[in-house]
């Protein structure tokens, strides 16, 4: 039975050319996290964090994605095209699959605020 909940950084904004941290947190379950996938709005995988194999950054994102902190992901050298939805998918046992959503808005403005509040989607 899936009892857990995913908390995410929710809707965030960041400056073009800057960087942003995408964070998800799985709570309210004792399930083992075997893998976390990070995906972009068009279903392309950015990175995988496997409990045994560690991090795998997909080639298309190698230059702009850094693993961590923790199970999170850091996006660097942001462009306007990075605006959109990002999903963290927690593969766990015995529960199964948990998914969290983050919406990132990349702003031209130099006064872009980076909100880091956690919320349950």
């Amino acid at each position: 039975m899936m009892t857990g909940t995913i908390e995410t950084t929710g809707n965030i904004s960041a400056k073009k050319g800057g960087s942003v941290i995408l964070q998800c947190h799985l709570s309210s379950t004792m399930a083992q996290v075997t893998q976390v996938n990070w995906e972009q709005h068009d279903h392309s995988l950015l990175a995988i964090r496997n409990a045994e194999l560690g991090w795998h950054i997909y080639p298309a994102f190698k230059d702009r994605v850094a693993p961590g902190p923790g199970l999170g992901l850091t996006l660097q050298s942001l462009t306007m095209n990075d605006t959109g939805e990002y999903f963290c998918t927690y593969h766990t046992y015995p529960d199964g699959t948990y998914r969290g959503r983050i919406f990132l808005e990349v702003l031209e403005s130099s006064v872009a605020e980076h909100s880091a509040r956690f919320q349950i989607p």
Epitope: Q32, N50, T97
Partner: antibody
């Protein structure tokens, strides 16, 4: 080319044991989680075991927990399923399958090996 | 466990036609449903995963849709090689479970 070749099936009496093998080739075996799925004579598919890439994590449905053991030898590119206390309802074709790297479903399957439990 | 009900169990169609196969889960499985093709003498083939994502190398005439409890596999402009048995499988929670299969035959 990804290839999975199962072996070790056969006829066994109720209460008996059997060890199935799956030889993998054409991919880096040690970086993929693997599963065993069986198909009953009535053609129903049932997932029976899964193991993580390094062998640390193993998972089973309640129907086989305590009777089946899944293991792997990454040096030999081989997956195993050890079955004990076999019952007539375990009669099936057993397939090994590779899980996608992102864990979404099973992307390659073997041809299967037949297991018959009968007295 | 999540029960998967697949329908129809049997379907007859002609090459060039468009067909749909349905799977219904006993509870929400988000988007996490896969579709497989089984043909005699061949290994099972993954067609669709995560509800609608086409597996690499699978022709675009195969498509998947749905989320929550109701899912559909659509094969448009049937080719002779598409006549086979199709299974759905939920990959949302353990234990992974399968539908009962749909045998697609030539009319």
């Amino acid at each position: 080319e990804v290839q999975l070749v199962e072996s070790g099936g056969g006829l066994v009496k109720p209460g008996g044991s059997l060890k199935l093998s799956c030889a993998a080739s054409g991919f880096t075996f040690s970086t993929y989680a693997m599963s065993w799925v069986r198909q009953s004579p009535e053609k129903r598919l049932e997932w029976v075991a899964e193991i993580s890439s390094g062998g640390t994590y193993t998972y089973f449905p309640d129907t086989v927990t305590g009777r089946f053991t899944i293991s792997r030898d990454n040096a030999k590119n081989t997956l195993y399923l050890e079955m004990s206390s076999l019952r007539s309802e375990d009669t099936a074709m057993y397939y090994c399958a590779r899980k996608r790297r992102d864990y979404y479903a099973m992307d390659y399957w073997g041809q299967g090996t037949s297991v018959t439990v009968s007295s | 466990d999540v029960q998967i009900t697949q329908s129809p169990s049997y379907l007859a169609a002609s090459p060039g036609e468009t067909i749909t196969i349905n799977c219904r889960a006993s509870k929400s499985i988000s988007k996490y449903l896969a579709w497989y093709q089984e043909k005699p003498g061949k290994t099972n083939k993954l067609l669709i995963y995560s509800g609608s994502t086409l597996q690499s190398g699978i022709p675009s005439r195969f498509s998947g849709s749905g989320s929550g409890t109701d899912f559909t596999l659509t094969i448009s402009s049937l080719e002779p090689e598409d006549f086979a048995v199709y299974y759905c499988q939920q990959h949302n929670e353990y234990p992974w479970t399968f539908g009962g299969g749909t045998k697609l035959e030539i009319k």
